[in-house]
């Protein structure tokens, strides 16, 4: 009985033409949605003039259908038992699942001003930038539509810069018609315990963003894990969104549409400072903003974003140190809404339901030579938006899963 099931499972989770796993892996059968909540700044003038706390009000959800495109350039390598692919990006706005339209306006940090003042720390260059910021009538904050903020707009200040810079700015620009990868993952043919584990990403086994073990590409992409998952396991996975590998630990047993699944969550320890979790020392890349690596809950991914001062956190600065959220008013973190979890069917290792939550923040610092940043008396890690990417196995697929997998075992 059990051995036969194990044998069948091992056969069906291999990533090759003809298996159940492969069919769902190439093009997910699950509808995946990405909801955005934008942090609308309520007091831009007071912040700019008096360095007041930033008052934000989240507005959302604005929902997009994502991950609906099949993997591209899928290529098996029989020699090293891997399969390589590109994961194309696409997003379709879903008005019926949104509180407004893509034309809705938001007051947000001026991405170009914040980034340029961080990238070009040379005071002379900052003076040049200041004259261009003034000439373009740009300020510390700006009003942008949802579409502009997410997918890109031509920035008036950057358009005046007389040397080669990208003049289009957007938090996810470019997105549509781009692809993530190349990923090269083990197909499991020779060793099922390695199935879906990433061998290389963009041709490399490490990222070049971090020091030491932090730079490693560990585990899978979280869509699935090697079969026969144990509750005691620490599930490693890589997320290109946050430019790092991370891990999840077992939290509870959950019944998902009649299928017993294990809920794995990202623990607060994964976001802790090196003081509390020494393993995280290599995610602390600078000493000033991190207050000598004692701050926690925010990840500086600037090295992964061409030097732009992007910080990733959990929504509403969940699990972050008080100093991070202190200059921001209007945040209400709670685990239920803001943590990330994966519901994994333990026999196959398939992720049947997930909620990936993260927040995109930008650092803005005072600058003596940039007029619109001159009155700031402190650094701010400014929340721009948070997102909730979710997917749940459909009823039809769940029935099939129950009859073919869990039903047979029970």
């Amino acid at each position: 009985g059990d051995l036969l099931i194990q044998k069948t499972i091992k056969k069906q989770v291999v990533l090759e033409e003809g298996t159940i796993a492969f069919k769902n892996w190439v093009k997910t059968g699950t509808e995946v949605y990405r909801q955005f909540w934008i942090f609308d700044v309520q007091n831009p003038q007071e912040v700019m003039m008096n360095s007041s706390n930033i008052q934000v009000k989240q507005r959302g959800p604005y929902t997009y259908r994502v991950r609906f495109l099949a993997k591209e350039n899928v290529t098996q390598d029989a020699e090293d038992n891997t399969v390589s692919f590109l994961q194309p990006n696409g997003a379709i706005f879903e008005p019926s699942l949104s509180v407004g339209t893509e034309a809705d306006n938001f007051t947000v940090l001026n991405l170009a001003v914040a980034a340029a003042s961080h990238i070009y720390q040379n005071q002379f260059v900052q003076m040049i930038l200041n004259s261009l910021i003034n000439k373009s009538k740009s300020s510390m904050f700006q009003v942008r539509t949802l579409r502009e903020l997410l997918w890109g707009y031509r920035d008036p200040f950057l358009s005046l810069v007389p040397y080669p810079v990208t003049t289009t700015v957007g938090l996810f620009y470019p997105y549509n018609n781009t692809a993530d990868g190349v990923y090269k993952v083990f197909n499991g043919k020779d060793n099922i315990s390695k199935v879906a584990i990433i061998d290389t990403y963009k041709g490399k086994r490490n990222l070049s963003y971090w020091e030491s073990h932090c730079d490693m590409i560990n585990g899978t992409d979280a869509a699935s894990f090697p079969p026969f998952v144990e509750k005691s396991q620490v599930l490693q996975f890589f997320s290109s969104d946050i430019c790092r590998s991370i891990y999840a630990v077992f939290e509870s047993d959950v019944n998902l549409k009649g299928i017993p699944v294990y809920r794995f969550v990202l623990p607060s320890k994964a976001f802790a400072s090196p003081v509390e979790n020494p393993d995280n020392y290599c995610f602390c890349t600078e000493k000033i903003i991190s207050k000598n690596c004692t701050s926690y809950g925010v990840l500086d991914i600037s090295k992964c974003k061409e030097g732009r001062p992007v910080y990733i956190s959990l929504p509403h600065f969940l699990y972050a140190s008080p100093d991070v959220s202190e200059p921001i008013d209007g945040l209400n973190p709670n685990e239920e809404e803001h943590r990330t979890y994966l519901d994994i069917e333990p026999i196959t290792g398939f992720t049947l339901q997930f909620a990936k939550r993260l927040q995109v923040n930008l650092l803005v610092k005072p600058s003596e030579k940039i007029q619109v940043l001159k009155n700031l008396k402190r650094n701010y890690i400014v929340p721009i938006l948070w997102l909730n990417e979710t997917g749940t196995i459909g009823d039809e697929k769940a029935n099939m899963f129950r009859s073919q997998v869990t039903g047979k075992i029970n």
Epitope: Y120, N122, F124
Partner: antibody, heavy 118, light 107 residues
Framework: QAQLQQSGAELVRPGASVTLSCKAS????????MNWVKQTPVHGLEWIGA????????AYNQKFKGKATLTADKSSSTAYMELRSLTSEDSAVYYC???????????WGQGTLVTVSA | EIKMTQSPSAMYASLGERVTITCKAS??????LSWFQQKPGKSPKTLIY???RLVDGVPSRFSGSGSGQDYSLTISSLEFEDMGIYYC?????????FGGGTKLEIK
């Protein structure tokens, strides 16, 4: 020891153009801005503009926009200033001087005398 | 543009005397001010930057002070080689601007 060596004196006709050079040595050229300053008995010292050789970004005194063009050649550690459509008003001593904000450093070239005369 | 008004435009002083030259900016220049000395036929020489910081190798009898719009250069005890023209420069914003100069001569 940092040094700025400027090109020799120029006698030029009205309407012509001239390019002055300033060769830097004894320091990393791209680490500092290069400023150009004009001196005449009537107007004293006037800042023309400056260039950051690292990125090629430059800033000009509006008064000299269209008159002066600043460039920098990283490979030879040399800064250049082209002056065009010269008139007698452009007769002056022109200095290059190195700076690195927020400081203004003590290195100046020896100056280049430009005389515009028919 | 920021206008720098330097005074006096010329002065005579005795050796050993304490000399003060002032520079007034048309707006706050945040201490982004340098002082230069120029001798006939020579390039200017930087004495002070950031309003009060002495350049290496410049004698300690020279000092700078001031903030906001008002700045001064002081020579605590005048020596013969101190004669020349003194200029201030603001580099708080473009275009950088110089004062008109103060001609210092020995009495």
């Amino acid at each position: 020891q940092a040094q700025l060596q400027q090109s020799g004196a120029e006698l030029v006709r009205p309407g012509a153009s001239v390019t002055l050079s300033c060769k830097a040595s004894g320091y990393t050229f791209t680490d500092y801005e290069m400023n150009w300053v004009k001196q005449t008995p009537v107007h004293g010292l006037e800042w023309i503009g400056a260039i950051d050789p690292e990125i090629g970004g430059s800033a000009y005194n509006q008064k000299f926009k269209g008159k002066a063009t600043l460039t920098a050649d990283k490979s030879s550690s040399t800064a250049y200033m082209e002056l065009r459509s010269l008139t007698s008003e452009d007769s002056a001593v022109y200095y290059c001087t190195r700076s690195k904000l927020p400081a203004w450093f003590p290195y100046w070239g020896q100056g280049t005398l430009v005389t515009v005369s028919a | 543009e920021i206008k720098m008004t330097q005074s006096p435009s010329a002065m005579y002083a005795s050796l050993g005397e304490r000399v003060t030259i002032t520079c007034k900016a048309s707006q706050d220049i945040n201490s982004y001010l340098s002082w230069f000395q120029q001798k006939p036929g020579k390039s200017p020489k930087t004495l002070i930057y950031r309003a009060n910081r002495l350049v290496d190798g410049v004698p300690s009898r020279f000092s700078g002070s001031g903030s906001g719009q008002d700045y001064s250069l002081t020579i605590s005890s005048l020596e013969f080689e101190d004669m020349g023209i003194y200029y201030c420069l603001q580099y708080e914003e473009f275009p950088y601007t110089f004062g008109g100069g103060t001609k210092l001569e020995i009495k």
